[in-house]
């Protein structure tokens, strides 16, 4: 996970400000007002491995 | 380093009453969804409680064989998460952990209590 | 309720092996951009270890040998190859819906 001004956070994740770590966007799904989630709209989801 | 610890069990009659209490320490327990699990030899692992947010005012959910009978509570201020048991029945005997979510996946545990109901 | 079911109820693997271990939801858990099936691993006397997230997102710290795959209804968890720590109970979860629930749970142990 990383710091805000360093690297970015994963593919499928987004920096969360209340939390200080990268959050998975797919708990967007249950907590859409999450800070992160913002992020995660612009940000293409982590592709499926079938 | 996130931690969870765990007090409460032992063992009780049935019809009696147990309070269940988990103490949180190293992650932001304000913004994580508190559950309870239970583990026995028949049921498994069994979600029964689980309590979100102020921001909502605190709303809960409980398993169906534990609803009426369970209640989940917890005080921020406190970083603690409680299971107030009442009416307690054979089948409710188990191992009984604490586990936070944020929102799917229960990333971590307490180290568990056993709670025994028998006469 | 998603009833999680779980296959094998145990399985017994070499060491260096490959460990496949089935979990099939009653009902899809999946939408168009990720699957909501998380795994576990549970040793003796300790609680559950959370392994991997979303179907596929390893845990930091979790070994590359621990891989999963699905989508829907079926998923796979994979160890490969297998070590001796590996010997434990592995559990799917999910969290689609109210209430999260847990397969029955499959014991890996080392031949």
């Known amino acids: 996970e990383q710091a805000p001004g360093t690297a970015p956070c994963s593919r499928g994740s987004s920096w969360s400000a209340d939390l200080d770590k990268c959050m998975d966007c797919a708990s967007c799904r249950a907590r859409p007002k999450s800070d992160f989630c913002l992020g995660c709209a612009a940000a293409p989801p982590a592709p499926f491995r079938l | 380093e996130v931690k969870l610890q765990q007090s409460g069990g032992g063992l009780v009659q049935p019809g009696g009453s147990m309070k269940l209490s988990c103490v949180a320490s190293g992650f932001t327990f304000s913004y994580y969804w508190m559950n309870w699990v239970r583990q026995s030899p028949e049921q498994g692992l069994e979600w029964i409680a689980e309590i979100r947010l102020q921001s909502n005012d605190y709303p809960t959910h409980y398993a169906e064989s534990v609803k009426g009978r369970f209640t989940i509570s917890r005080d921020d201020s406190k970083n603690s998460v409680y299971l107030q048991m009442n009416n307690l029945r054979p089948e409710d005997t188990g191992i009984y952990y604490c586990?936070?979510?944020?929102?799917?996946?229960?990333?971590?545990w307490g180290q568990g209590t056993t709670l025994t109901v028998s006469s | 309720d998603t009833v999680l079911t779980q296959s094998p109820a145990s399985l017994v693997v070499s060491l260096g092996q490959r460990a496949t271990i089935s979990c099939r939801a009653s009902?899809?858990?999946?939408?168009?951009?990720?699957?909501?099936i998380h795994w576990y691993q549970q040793k003796p006397g300790q609680p559950p270890k959370f392994l991997i997230k979303y179907a596929s997102n390893r845990d930091s710290g979790v070994p590359a040998r621990f891989s999963g795959s699905g989508s829907g209804t079926d998923f796979t968890l994979n160890i490969h190859p297998v070590e001796e720590d590996d010997t434990a109970i592995y559990y799917c979860?999910?969290?689609?819906?109210?209430?999260?629930?847990f397969g029955a749970g499959t014991k890996l142990e080392l031949q």
């Open positions: 586990a936070c979510r944020y929102a799917d996946y229960f990333d971590h």
């Open positions: 009902q899809s858990v999946s939408t168009s951009d990720y699957s909501y």
């Open positions: 979860q999910h969290s689609w819906e109210i209430p999260p629930t």
